[in-house]
């Protein structure tokens, strides 16, 4: 028999998103500076480029955990019954949500470790020394940029909390742990906490973006930065989740 | 039925400690400088203040895992028998030790991640650049402060080892893992390694404190720094554990 | 009965390797500078020395997971049958491979955390400030060393990916997780991914080494640096694995 049948779809999707994001980031971060000003930024590939790919894959996969639930609710509302069978593709997707979630967590953890490794890199050390040299040359006593400090303190903190919640979801997916929970407890963690972690991940990305939305320098060769693309699907899911949470629709769904 | 009945008490206690520590740290780190010299340190809230709360909660919860055992031993010694029923509150507490321990580990991991994120923050980068500028201004060739270096090398190392041991306790709490152990093996890990991690956590906090016990600057508005409050309960537990480990008392308890 | 019978051998081996590596690193990093130029580097013990020990133990234990399989294959090829009993020591070793692997992962995680803690240490801060001061004094505009940047970006990235794969192996070792997998799935993860992580760990070490193989300064008191010793066994295992993977030998083994 086949190996890991339930993992095929999530791994395929993850691989596609990862490949596309890698090529897209490579184009923007490495090929563009090479083509336009002969700057060689190939050293960025092993960590900086990879670490643009990881959060993109992670947040997209997490959105794909909650998107089929949204679609299913819309389908049920449209059909007016829960007894009509879902289309095959949606059924298949619904059954692989756990795998999507675990993959999302895997990529999120990798993203965290890659991020934490930033200041230990030689590239960062050399940049710091050069910045210090420039600060002395410019006779600039204070390097502090208040809004930039705020931006990073907030998005790092939210990212850690989001990852922590995602970790709880992952732990409760361990068979013997989920077996020790009642169905209501398991459902509570997976649905409520899952959406909270998606929300935190989205806010984390938006605060990372900060004022870059209107920064023309971000639009390399007229392409938007990855975070803009990354937050699109999560925002869609969160909006629909919020709409379906409205009392009128919520009652209708519960009736069905 | 209720959701997560065994988690109610630990989560309540954790929430209370976290809230109080947050407000206390906020008072000392943010409100005091604002009130006394109009210094705006609000940027400290998302990471620095939170990361004073996390270890406080973690070490307190870990102490609360081993405190009921100490109380139970004292009650048994006082009663001279193990057949007399424990008071209801102690019984309830004894049954939620696993949850206290897992919550302690959760907060410890968060504390570790927050701590590891320190050097990647913009605030740290800007401070580093300012320090470098100032060192040049002062014409100071060597910034090295030996005792400070030692302090940090030791407390970081002990913290990591303590966390590693706590991780072993957490892993052996996974139902299928604990099922694969004999009762003696499980008890050995949970009791012996647990106390070792509490000891390491306490030493970690004490070495973090170093010479701050006698530094008048630490006593903001006559309030002691958080680490002083944090180590109180763990030290009490460790002292009682040591006393109950004395041959004379140990024999008595084993007899009972 | 005995506590943790299957863990005796792995823990003994790990303790021996750790102790020898610790003493060896102490000799090279602390005692040598003290004896030859009265430089006191004792502050290196809690983190820097320990973090030379951890990867050494980790990669050796990981190699020891796959070495008995290689030996078993050679024994079977030599005997021409799989029905002849393995020697007792090999049998015992084969049965403790899971424990060797989990210990390897434990040390790898510790190595990662210790490594990530480097830039948050005071010793690193003070060194950075001194380097910045020297750069200004030398009027050196650019500190960048391209090959050094490349070296670190690559070895850090490979190390993280290797650790991630090792984590997958560890997770699938949780009884309830392994129970949910078919034997073929479990075997696929443990054999294929295991060898991949050993390969990545070895490349990680080799790229860490970079051009240090021919750097005479690395040979303190004529002793090779730890990474040279560390990669020996993994390379042996990988070479033998590759040889046994050759079509001619692979067919022979499958026949047996």
């Amino acid at each position: 028999q086949e190996l890991f049948p339930q993992w095929h779809l999530p791994i395929k999707i993850a691989a596609i998103i990862a490949s596309l994001t890698f090529l897209y980031t490579l184009l923007r971060e490495v090929i563009h500076p090479l083509a336009t000003s002969h700057q060689q930024y190939f050293y960025k590939i092993p960590i900086l480029v990879i670490n643009k790919v990881l959060p993109m894959v992670s947040i997209t996969l997490l959105a794909l955990v909650y998107l089929p639930g949204v679609i299913a609710a819309i389908v049920q509302l449209h059909n007016g019954t829960k007894y009509k069978k879902f289309p095959h593709w949606l059924d298949k997707w619904m059954l692989t949500r756990k795998q999507f979630g675990l993959l999302s967590f895997f990529f999120a953890v990798l993203h965290a470790i890659y991020s934490l490794s930033y200041p230990m890199r030689r590239s960062y050390r050399y940049k710091l020394l050069n910045w210090a040299y420039q600060q002395v040359q410019q006779n600039k006593e204070d390097a502090w940029i208040e809004h930039d400090v705020w931006r990073m303190e907030i998005y790092v903190s939210l990212g850690i909390v989001g990852l922590a919640i995602l970790a709880l979801l992952a732990v409760t997916s361990i068979p013997s742990v989920s077996d020790s929970l009642t169905w209501r407890e398991f459902h509570y963690i997976q649905s409520k906490l899952g959406i909270v972690s998606l929300l935190l991940g989205t806010i984390h990305a938006l605060i990372f973006a900060w004022n870059k939305w209107i920064d023309i320098k971000q639009f390399v060769w007229y392409t938007p930065p990855t975070f803009m693309i990354a937050v699109f699907l999560p925002i869609v899911v969160l909006i629909f989740k919020s709409i379906l949470f409205l009392p009128c629709l919520r009652k209708k769904i519960l009736k069905i | 039925q209720e959701l997560f009945p065994q988690w109610h008490l630990p989560i309540k206690i954790a929430a209370i400690i976290a809230s109080l520590t947050f407000l206390y740290t906020l008072l000392r780190e943010v409100i005091h400088p604002l009130a006394t010299s109009h210094q705006q340190y609000f940027y400290k809230i998302p990471i620095l203040v939170i990361n004073k709360v996390l270890p406080m909660v973690s070490i307190t919860l870990l102490a609360l895992v081993y405190l009921p055992g100490v109380i139970a031993a004292i009650v048994q010694l006082h009663n001279g028998t193990k057949y007399k029923k424990f008071p209801h509150w102690l019984d309830k507490w004894m049954l939620t030790r696993k949850q206290f321990g897992l919550l302690s580990f959760f907060f410890a991991v968060l504390h570790a991640i927050y701590s590891l994120s320190y050097p990647m923050r913009r605030s740290y980068r800007y401070k580093l650049l300012n320090w470098a500028y100032q060192q040049v201004q002062q014409n100071k060739e060597d910034a090295w402060i030996e005792h400070d270096v030692w302090r940090m090398e030791i407390y970081v190392s002990l913290g990591i080892v303590g966390l590693a041991i706590l991780a072993l306790l957490a892993v052996t709490s996974i139902p299928s893992v604990s099922d694969s152990l004999t009762w003696r093996e499980f008890h050995y890990i949970q009791s012996k390694l647990g106390i070792v991690s509490l000891l390491l956590g306490t030493i970690h906090a004490l070495i973090f404190a170093w010479n701050k016990w006698i530094d008048i600057k630490q006593f903001v508005w006559y309030t002691p720094p958080t680490f002083m409050i944090a180590v109180f309960l763990p030290i009490v537990v460790l002292i009682f554990k040591s006393i109950l480990f004395l041959p004379c008392l140990r024999k008595k308890i084993l007899k009972i | 009965q005995e506590l943790f019978p299957q863990w005796h051998l792995p823990i003994k081996i790990a303790a021996i390797i750790a102790s020898l590596t610790f003493l060896y690193t102490l000799l090279r990093e602390v005692i040598h500078p003290l004896a030859t130029s009265h430089q006191q580097y004792f502050y290196k013990i809690p983190i820097l020395v320990i973090n030379k020990v951890l990867p050494m133990v980790s990669i050796t234990l990981l190699a020891l997971v796959y070495l008995p399989g290689v030996i078993a294959a050679i024994v079977q090829l030599h005997n021409g049958t799989k029905y002849k009993k393995f020697p007792h020591w090999l049998d015992k070793w084969m049965l403790t491979r899971k424990q060797f692997g989990l210990l390897s992962f434990f040390f790898a995680v510790l190595h990662a955390i210790y490594s990530l803690s480097y830039p948050m240490r005071r010793s690193y801060r003070y060194k950075l400030l001194n380097w910045a001061y020297q750069q200004v004094q030398q009027n050196k505009e650019d500190a960048w060393i391209e090959h050094d940047v490349w070296r670190m970006e690559i070895y850090v990235s490979l190390g993280i990916v290797g650790l991630a794969i090792l984590a997958l192996l560890a997770v699938t070792s949780i009884p309830s997780v392994s129970d949910s997998l078919t034997w073929r799935e479990f075997h696929y993860i443990q054999s294929k991914l295991g060898i991949v992580s050993l390969l990545l760990g070895t490349i990680h070490a080799l790229i860490f080494a970079w051009n240090k193989w021919i750097d005479i300064k690395q040979f303190v008191w004529y002793t090779p640096p730890t990474f040279m010793i560390a990669v020996f066994l993994p390379i042996v295992v990988l070479i033998f694995k590759s040889i046994l993977f050759l079509p001619c030998l692979r067919k022979k083994i499958l026949k047996i």
Partner: antibody, heavy 124, light 113 residues
Amino acid sequence: EVQLVESGGGLVQPGGSLRLSCAASGYSITSDYAWNWIRQAPGKGLEWVGYISNSGSTSYNPSLKSRFTISRDNSKNTLYLQMNSLRAEDTAVYYCARERNYDYDDYYYAMDYWGQGTLVTVSS
Amino acid sequence: DIQMTQSPSSLSASVGDRVTITCKSSQSLLYRSNQKNYLAWYQQKPGKAPKLLIYWASTRESGVPSRFSGSGSGTDFTLTISSLQPEDFATYYCQQYYNYPRTFGQGTKVEIK
């Protein structure tokens, strides 16, 4: 009680040299403090000359064109100001003053203790 | 170098008066990283050494009467004596310790009216 006592002032000819001393009592000069020299020309304001930190690093006012050197003798708990190539405009009362040593939180500190000063007159 | 400009250069006041001395720096003395203004105020009486009154622009040195207060941030600072006492007649200096070289204001002489 911390006390700083300057000495070594007096009349010196232009182009000459002079060494001022500042004896500290009640505190070790190698502890958590940096030590400054400040001068005040007759009827004028204060001018910072330079400082020596607890680690021994020094910094000077660029306007003095490297004519002045600050040093210390730890065993005598005394710091010194060596003045070379003296000019008439160097005539002033020279003070030594203490400031808390640089730290990574508060950076610099104000000068909290001053000596009574010693008069240096540069005249032919 | 950072220029420190004090005003007025001298003033006459009576006992009990409220006195305000201003000090302007040629650049900001506020370190944004720790939100401190690196400005000190000193009092000097004839034939005596200066005495520290205020540091970090607004923090009173221990032992200094509460009638002395400092305020301001960035480049504009003020020393206020809420009710002038006979022993307060002296010259007052502001000083920046934001960077090297340390620089002082030219001084403000407070005389009896």
